[in-house]
Interface confidence: medium
């Protein structure tokens, strides 16, 4: 009922002292090699001269950090990155970084990279609103700090600030055009 040599599993390493013979009921725990992570149970048990259990080591490393337009990587580059490793970006002048400066290898996937945007902070067209419109001709690009005003269609009442402003490449919250309550 004893078990002989330990079974081998890909990228898994048995822990503790190796023995020639293992008694029934004895357990051996495995750990994973670098870049790998245990998926499920990490033990095997000796039962009726056989080992039961199958430790599985999953590759959780990452390769090729995401490419970020108008940016370059400032941390050391590796052919393979272990889970938890971070990579830092820097924007080329005159671009400005929005988002996390670093990406991280998280169990085989990179976290979301930053964006390098034109630091002028321009805005696109103002957001459309139901039952209302802006009072000026819409442009495709607006300079930082520029404002537009909304007006509501007949019978609708404006709630909120009628003027919105372009800041940091984003428009402030537009107003709503509400139908007045009919009594």
């Amino acid at each position: 009922t004893d078990c002989l040599s330990l079974p081998s599993f890909e990228n898994a390493i048995p822990m503790g002292e190796k023995k020639d013979v293992y008694k029934a009921g004895e357990q051996v725990t495995y750990t994973c090699a670098t870049y790998y992570k245990m998926d499920g149970a990490s033990n095997v048990t000796c039962i009726n001269s056989r080992w039961t259990g199958r430790p599985t080591c999953r590759d959780t490393s990452c390769v090729n950090p995401p490419t970020v337009q108008n940016a370059y990587i400032v941390s050391r580059q590796m052919s393979k990155y272990p889970s938890g490793e971070r990579v830092r970006y820097q924007c080329r002048s005159p671009y400005e970084m929005f988002g996390d400066e670093e990406v991280m290898c998280l169990n085989g996937n990179w976290t979301e990279p930053p964006q390098c945007k034109d630091s002028t902070g321009k805005c696109g067209p103002p957001p459309p609103i139901d039952n209302g419109d802006i009072t000026s001709f819409p442009l495709s690009v607006y300079a930082p700090a520029s404002s537009v005003e909304y007006q509501c269609q007949n019978l609708y009442q404006l709630e909120g600030n009628k003027r919105i402003t372009c800041r940091n490449g984003q428009w402030s919250e537009p107003p709503k055009c509400l139908h007045p309550c009919v009594i």
Partner: antibody, heavy 117, light 107 residues
Framework: QVQLRQSGPGLVQPSQSLSITCTVS????????VYWVRQSPGKGLEWLGV???????DYSAAFISRLSISKDNSKSQVFFKMNSLQADDTAIYYC???????????WGQGTSVTVSS | QIVLSQSPTILSASPGEKVTMTCRAS?????MHWYQQKPGSSPKPWIY???NLASGVPARFSGSGSGTSYSLTISRVEAEDAATYYC??????????FGAGTKLELK
């Protein structure tokens, strides 16, 4: 270990501004972004804005006209300022560290703010 | 902005039971994160990017989903799991939004 400690007033008069300081330890603000989130019984958890490690900011469109987030890396402090508070801004305000993928891993203890005269 | 609808609002379970709570997005999202919050405490990260357990989270928790439908599953509920669980999304050019929460109660 990583900690975010918040300090700020508990009571704010209507139409006044709210200022909260988030002092961090165990990590550097030059490496991590810090988010601001609030929690109210009526609206649940709401994202307000973030200051990234490089100092740039992103604000929720709903708050961009009255919110300002800044920081002092050398003092490990992030500053939150919201103007023109009204009764429905009554909430618990949290700062939280960016983990990556726009998730938050460590949170401050929260600042309970009541807007009332 | 993207609206996250969590169901059920309250989930009542017995210790040892398997439970699943869902989070549906009004349109497709890039990432879904989950947080656990107990009364009087700040939220704690629980699951990152759909399926990655945060540090210290027991292996009985798992997360799955894609597109507009995501779920958090507890294989065998324990008393310490009683809390409110919030989902949070991140989608390109959309603000971060949270679900209204699922409160897990133990019978």
């Amino acid at each position: 270990q990583v900690q975010l400690r918040q300090s700020g007033p508990g009571l704010v008069q209507p139409s006044q501004s709210l200022s909260i300081t988030c002092t961090v330890s165990g990590f550097s603000l030059t490496n991590y972004g810090v988010y601001w989130v609030r929690q109210s019984p009526g609206k649940g958890l709401e994202w307000l804005g973030v200051i990234w490690s490089g100092g740039t900011t992103d604000y929720s469109a709903a708050f961009i006209s009255r919110l300002s987030i800044s920081k002092d890396n050398s003092k490990s402090q992030v500053f939150f300022k919201m103007n023109s508070l009204q009764a429905d801004d009554t909430a618990i305000y949290y700062c939280a560290r960016n983990f990556g993928n726009y998730a938050m891993d460590y949170w401050g203890q929260g600042t309970s703010v009541t807007v009332s005269s | 902005q993207i609206v996250l609808s969590q169901s059920p609002t309250i989930l009542s379970a017995s210790p040892g039971e398997k439970v699943t709570m869902t989070c549906r997005a009004s349109s497709s999202v890039t990432y879904m994160h989950w947080y656990q919050q107990k009364p009087g405490s700040s939220p704690k990260p629980w699951i990152y990017a759909t399926s990655n357990l945060a540090s210290g989270v027991p292996a009985r928790f798992s997360g799955s989903g894609s597109g507009t439908s995501y779920s958090l599953t507890i294989s065998r509920v324990e008393a310490e799991d009683a809390a409110t669980y919030y989902c949070q999304q991140r989608s390109s050019s959309n603000p971060l939004t949270f679900g209204a929460g699922t409160k897990l109660e133990l019978k």
